[in-house]
């Protein structure tokens, strides 16, 4: 007989859950790569762009060996929540130019939300604490100019791409350790 009614479903195979999270992450990575390319094509980037409000990259080649599942999932979820807020901000505040990419940005935001829900589910199934961000989210201010918001878009998509790229590698590595 299955678990009693009302009790949380405990996954019989965390690896399968992790697989599903990896698939979603990979899919989002492909979407982000495509949208970043569209952005570069439509609004050529003059060099690399940074945005102080974006999270710093959590993983690198040097840290891959010491990754722990709880830490990776928690940090990934916090970082992706930040990127979700930034994409939402871009859609609402960045001006008419970016409205030409509205369907793609909307789809990206929806996929990001789906991945965040999947990570939350994975963490609850693995009985990991649902850690809140260290500090409350800083409100994102208005872009100083249309040009500034395009630079911000390049930074957001570039940062999200890097984060997802490392996330796929990290999650795949952790799967082998389960």
């Amino acid at each position: 007989p299955g678990p009693p009614a009302g009790s949380p479903r405990v996954s019989s195979d965390p690896r399968a859950d992790l697989d599903s999270a990896v698939l979603l992450t990979r899919s989002l990575l492909a979407d982000t790569r495509q949208l970043a390319a569209q952005m570069r094509d439509k609004f050529p980037a003059d060099g690399d762009h940074n945005l102080d409000s974006l999270p710093t990259l959590a993983m690198s080649a040097g840290t891959l060996g010491s990754l722990q599942l709880p830490g990776v999932l928690t940090r990934l979820r916090v970082d992706l929540m930040s990127y979700f807020r930034h994409v939402q901000w871009l859609r609402r505040a960045a001006g008419p130019s970016l409205k030409t990419l509205e369907p793609e940005l909307g789809a990206l935001q929806a996929r990001l939300e789906r991945l965040l829900r999947r990570l939350q589910l994975l963490m609850s199934r693995l009985a990991l604490p649902q850690a809140a961000p260290d500090q409350p989210a800083v409100p994102l201010g208005p872009p100083a100019s249309a040009w500034g918001s395009i630079r911000a878009a390049h930074a957001i998509l570039g940062g999200l791409h890097l984060t997802l790229d490392w996330a796929v590698r990290g999650l795949l590595l952790l799967k082998t350790r389960l």
Epitope: R92, A93, G95, K99, E102, P142, P143, S145, I150
Partner: antibody, heavy 117, light 111 residues
């Protein structure tokens, strides 16, 4: 300080054309999307068109689509509105406005266009 | 017929608090930021509130904006005679791919 000065308004007959200009100063013109907004005598504000900071994206109100063309020359810090096939209902004060996002933070003083036979 | 709906007029006496409403839909107010403009007689409009509730520098804190769902409102407290003007709300509309305005509210300061 930021300044936007419109010119080119005047009296014109229905069906004729007119070109408005907006000279910008006091800021990096090429960094900002620019809009035209109009106001018929005694009426409310009506958005007309917007052009992106580098000039590649343009959006128009349905009421002017196909008749009006917004353009800009970033080397001259100037915004334009080419108005063709003018109608009596286009009679209004035309304002150019600067926008960092979707809000107009600076407006010109306006130029009056009167379409009358 | 404006896409955003505002009351045509509002009034109050000096020192009072007045609220002006602005009603829209999911494609404008519901999914984009709301801005408010003040137009004094014979002058160009001036930005009063942007990003739903932010005030540009130089705008007194007597003016405040708020938004809930597909409606927004502008509140003016400690009403003064110089506040007598037309007030307009605006937002980007995703369906129309353009900026939409309310019809404007003429504020009269009595007495």
């Amino acid at each position: 300080q930021v300044q936007l000065v419109e010119s080119g308004g005047g009296v014109v007959q229905p069906g004729r054309s007119l070109r408005l200009s907006c000279a910008a100063s006091g800021f990096t013109f090429s960094h900002y999307d620019m809009h035209w907004v109009r106001q018929a005598p005694g009426k409310g504000l009506e958005w007309v068109a917007v052009i992106s900071y580098e000039g590649s994206n343009k959006f128009y109100a349905d009421s002017v689509k196909g008749r009006f063309t917004i353009s800009r020359d970033n080397s001259k810090n100037t915004l334009y509105l080419q108005m063709n096939s003018l109608r009596a209902e286009d009679t209004a004060v035309y304002y150019c406005a600067r926008t960092p996002g979707f809000h107009f933070d600076y407006w010109g003083q306006g130029t009056l266009v009167t379409v009358s036979s | 017929q404006s896409v955003l709906t505002q009351p045509p007029s509002a009034s109050g006496t000096p020192g009072q608090r007045v609220t002006i409403s602005c009603s829209g839909s999911s494609s404008n107010i519901g999914s984009n930021y709301v801005n408010w403009y003040q137009q004094l007689p014979g002058t160009a409009p001036k930005l009063l509130i942007y990003y739903d509730d932010l005030r540009p520098s130089g705008v007194p804190d007597r003016f405040s904006g708020s938004k809930s769902g597909t409606s927004a409102s502008l509140a003016i407290s400690g009403l003064r005679s110089e506040d007598e003007a037309d007030y307009y709300c605006s937002a980007w509309d995703d369906s129309l791919s353009g900026v939409v305005f309310g019809g404007g509210t003429k504020l009269t300061v009595l007495g």
